[in-house]
């Protein structure tokens, strides 16, 4: 009888991934001179060695442990930024607020960023024909459980002021099924967190509502506070010119409501 | 069962475009799984994959390094067929013409069409 | 990277015959191989997949292999018959998943 492989519902490894993530960790290690040491052979060997020859909904954060150690980093746990469903804006952001980190500035999230993997039960390949989809197959897949697992560590080692970016163009602009409403709000901890503060950014150039007055923003101030966390939220109404008053703060037109 | 039938000219003209058709039965063109290839076949290349194309939640297409600036593979949905488009030919691309059928499961070609002659000469 | 095959073999009805495809870059334990059968003014037929998985309704008689210590793949065809005298093509992939065929073998049923 002939042994069919499963189809997924979800698109397959993205293209040329082992050699993308082999180069993205020597750029990331050029740049980056505290990760200098960092060996990115020994990284590549422990990230195919979570989900190579393993069923791809049966993935476990045990899984990548091995990767998690070789890519431990220490950034200011006090310039930490979240984001949900606006990660260009966030990104553009820390481009420019350079002591400021979203979880992709780090080494194993831009490892990953916007990539997809999986392999097969038992054999030694690369699935690039098919992954799990987190929702019509499975959410133990390689991709979610690796997303799980690095944001779940970015978030326990946070202190002090910690900011996320949320997308104000969304119905729901805070998501409990997001990353950050799931995994990240979960894992903030009470005794090194004092406050979380919310940017939330408009869509449109007219658009002058309080959107932290938006349920899906009082349900996310309710759930930090049971945390014994303060929540503060900010209107950024304009996030182009946000953006250009980051790079250049001393201009005549910064010092208004942005 | 699921058959291909290609359809083309067997003449094309230097610099001129060369267009080929290939009508799915038995399965979708829209299909979640398969993907649907063109290959060609001449005595100096032997047999050569040129492209693909395949619908995952929106359509894809991959192609052939060597002819990825003179092709196109379009999905026809409402006649469930894929047509193969070659620019700027020349007596080069002289070969058989081949569509077929990736069923998802296995990388390989579990269907393929008649295969369609198409000589380039003026 | 390129796939190569001998231009052709022979041998005798009954006997056994092996064909191989050798990667020249790449581990050929990463991708998978398949296998093709292409009689005179036919399309090819796939007679191997995922390097050793015969579809149905082809014979036992044929069987895929990989020797990674020679980064290659193998056809092998046992108890020959003359129906069997045609062209055998291995294919391949990149993680670009661009797909590769091999230069192919005639193989003659003396």
């Known amino acids: 009888v002939p042994r069919w492989r499963q189809q997924w519902s979800g698109p397959g490894t993205t293209k040329r991934f082992p050699e993308t993530v082999l180069a993205r960790c020597v750029k990331y290690t050029e740049i980056h001179p505290e990760m200098r040491h960092v060996d990115c052979q020994s990284v590549w060997d422990a990230f195919k060695g979570a989900f190579i020859s393993k069923h791809p909904c049966n993935i476990t954060e045990e899984d990548y442990q091995p990767l998690m150690k070789l890519g431990t980093q220490t950034v200011p746990c006090n310039k930490i930024l979240l984001w949900s469903r606006i990660k260009d804006l966030a990104h553009q952001f820390t481009q420019v607020q350079r002591d400021m980190f979203t979880l992709e500035d780090t080494l194993l999230g831009y490892l990953a960023d916007d990539l997809t993997w999986c392999g097969e039960f038992n054999t030694s390949k690369i699935n690039y024909q098919s992954c799990p989809d987190w929702r019509k197959d499975c959410s133990n897949n390689p991709v979610s459980v690796f997303w799980k697992t690095v944001s779940r560590r970015f978030a326990e080692a946070a202190c002090d002021v910690v900011h996320v970016m949320l997308n104000g163009s969304r119905s729901k602009i805070f998501d409990k099924n997001s990353t950050f409403g799931s995994v990240e709000v979960h894992n903030l901890q009470p005794e090194k967190v004092q406050t979380l503060e919310a940017w939330v950014i408009h869509g449109g150039r007219e658009d002058s509502r309080d959107l932290c007055q938006d349920p899906t923003i009082k349900e996310l101030e309710s759930i930090i506070s049971k945390r014994n966390i303060q929540f503060s939220c900010k209107n950024i109404y304009r996030p182009d010119k946000f953006l250009q008053c980051v790079k250049n703060p001393e201009d005549s037109s910064c010092t208004s409501e942005i | 069962q699921v058959q291909l039938q290609q359809s083309g000219p067997g003449l094309v003209k230097p610099s001129q475009t060369l267009s080929l058709t290939c009508v799915i039965s038995?399965?979708?063109?829209?299909?979640?799984?398969?993907?649907w290839n063109w290959i060609r076949q001449s005595p100096s290349r032997g047999l050569e994959w040129l492209g693909r194309?395949?619908?995952?939640?929106?359509?894809?297409?991959d192609y052939a390094v060597s002819v990825e600036s003179r092709i196109i593979v379009n999905p026809d949905t409402s006649k469930n067929q894929f047509s193969l488009q070659l620019n700027s030919v020349t007596p080069e691309d002289t070969a058989v013409y081949y569509c077929a059928r990736d069923p998802g499961y296995f990388y390989g070609l579990d269907v393929w069409g008649q295969g369609t002659m198409v000589t380039v000469s003026s | 990277f390129m796939l190569t095959q001998p231009h052709s073999v022979s041998e005798s009805p009954g006997k056994t015959v092996t064909i191989p495809c050798t990667r020249s870059s790449g581990t050929i334990a990463d991708y998978y191989v398949q296998w093709y059968q292409q009689r005179p003014d036919s399309s090819p037929i796939i007679v191997i997949y995922?390097?050793?998985?015969?579809p149905s309704g082809v014979p036992d008689r044929f069987s895929g292999s990989i020797d990674s210590s020679s980064n290659s793949a193998s056809l092998t065809i046992s108890g020959l018959k003359t129906e069997d005298e045609a062209a055998y093509y291995c294919?391949?992939?990149?993680?670009?998943?661009?797909?590769?065929f091999g230069g192919g073998t005639k193989l003659t049923v003396l």
């Open positions: 294919q391949s992939y990149d993680s670009t998943n661009h797909w590769v």
């Open positions: 194309t395949y619908y995952r939640s929106k359509w894809h297409n």
């Open positions: 995922d390097d050793n998985q015969r």
């Open positions: 038995g399965d979708s063109v829209s299909s979640n799984s398969a993907a």
